[in-house]
């Protein structure tokens, strides 16, 4: 029961986490910037992985996509890749974990198969969560290192004067969504791995010994029964009867839990 609960909870937590990773990847607010905040109008700029937006206090918002790939920093491309890998791994993990759920029966799937699938999905969730956390952390690092030292920098450009104004980029909501979502996916993956241990079928810790009566008269040797149980000195299950009684090792090469003494 506890295993089913752990597996189910792990699945739900991972599902929420992956939904969060998808949401964070699509969000525009990875970095935010206050451009003006005067009595006339307040203008904010926020940038995501795919486009940049300008929003005014009036409610007007204009977004433009990063149409060129070549002009974008390698770090942004790396963050995009990490987030996409995280989503893909998470989605595959979810698909695998659905079939691995103990509460869902599919044909005559054995517990060992379900255990393997649970472990696989758990590992996928862990890697997915780590990808998301890494991606968001790389972006956050970009923001921290991107603050310009100079307050204003004047230079002459094409068609007149150009002035650079220092505007600080701060952490956007998407970063926090990404961190939390990545963490949830990671926790969900760990829970799935824990559940996998409980799902794995226990192996028998005893050796069964079978006795086969023969047509000939069996000569009883004293101490034979004690030795044959496996608890005495005869632990190697050596042959102690002259007749038809044989050890399990000699009769069957693959003992199973369905053999009875």
């Amino acid at each position: 029961m506890a295993v089913t609960a752990c597996q189910g909870l792990g699945f739900v937590v991972s599902l929420i986490g992956i939904a969060g990773i998808i949401a964070a990847t699509c969000m525009d607010q990875w970095s935010t910037q206050d451009l003006y905040n005067n009595p006339v109008t307040a203008v904010f700029n926020y940038q995501g992985l795919w486009r940049s937006c300008v929003r005014e206090s009036s409610g007007f918002t204009e977004c433009r996509g990063y149409f060129t790939l070549l002009g974008l920093p390698a770090m942004l491309q790396a963050v995009r890749a990490l987030m996409i890998v995280g989503i893909v791994l998470g989605a595959i993990g979810l698909l695998v974990s659905i079939f691995a759920l103990k509460c869902i029966r599919i044909g005559s799937m054995e517990d060992s198969a379900k255990a393997n699938m649970t472990l696989t999905s758990g590992i996928m969730f862990i890697v997915s969560g780590l990808c998301a956390i890494a991606g968001v952390s790389v972006f956050a690092n970009m923001l921290v290192t991107n603050f310009w030292m100079s307050t204003a920098n004047m230079y002459t450009g094409m068609g007149g004067m150009v002035q650079t104004v220092q505007t600080r980029y701060t952490f956007g909501a998407a970063l926090f969504v990404g961190w939390v979502a990545g963490g949830l996916t990671l926790i969900g993956g760990v829970m799935m791995c824990i559940a996998c241990r409980g799902l794995a079928p226990e192996e028998t810790n005893y050796k069964a010994v079978s006795y086969h009566a023969s047509g000939h008269s069996v000569a009883y040797k004293p101490g034979g029964f004690k030795a044959s149980t496996g608890f005495g000195s005869n632990t190697k299950n050596k042959k102690i009867y002259d007749g038809g009684a044989r050890t399990e090792d000699e009769v069957q090469s693959y003992p199973s839990k369905h053999d009875y003494v």
Epitope: L35, S57, Y66, T164
Partner: nanobody, 121 residues
């Protein structure tokens, strides 16, 4: 590289009208605000009018009711319709655009070369 190109300046009689236009070209992410400033001979550059992409406008007291700023977001162009011109409106009119050039780049204030407006009495 971003370029601002003004046009429409010239000589006009007092009480007359002129329409200035300024087009922004080049590679950039977002234009935040666009506006017009002017500099009369021997004076400081002063704000005439500005507009945001959303249509919020502001005017200097000296031109309120006479000048109208408008924009065409699709063409990244700003216009200044000047009516009831006075001799004191004589100046070089500069186009201004606050632009975000690229990803995580700082806001840059771009200025045009200026177009001369002369109002004769």
């Amino acid at each position: 590289q971003v370029k601002l190109e003004e046009s429409g300046g010239g000589l006009v009689q007092a009480g007359g009208s002129l329409r200035l236009s300024c087009a922004v070209s080049g590679n950039f992410l977002n234009i935040v605000t666009m506006g017009w400033y002017r500099q009369a001979p021997g004076k400081q550059r002063e704000l005439v009018a500005t507009t945001t992409r959303g249509g919020s406008t502001s005017y200097s007291d000296s031109v309120k009711g006479r000048f109208t700023i408008s924009r065409d977001n699709a063409k990244s162009t700003v216009y200044l319709q000047m009516n009831s011109l006075k001799p004191e409106d004589t100046a070089v009119y500069y186009c201004n655009a606050d632009i975000i050039p690229g990803f995580l780049q700082q806001l840059t204030v771009h200025w045009g070369q200026g177009t001369r407006v002369t109002v004769s009495s």
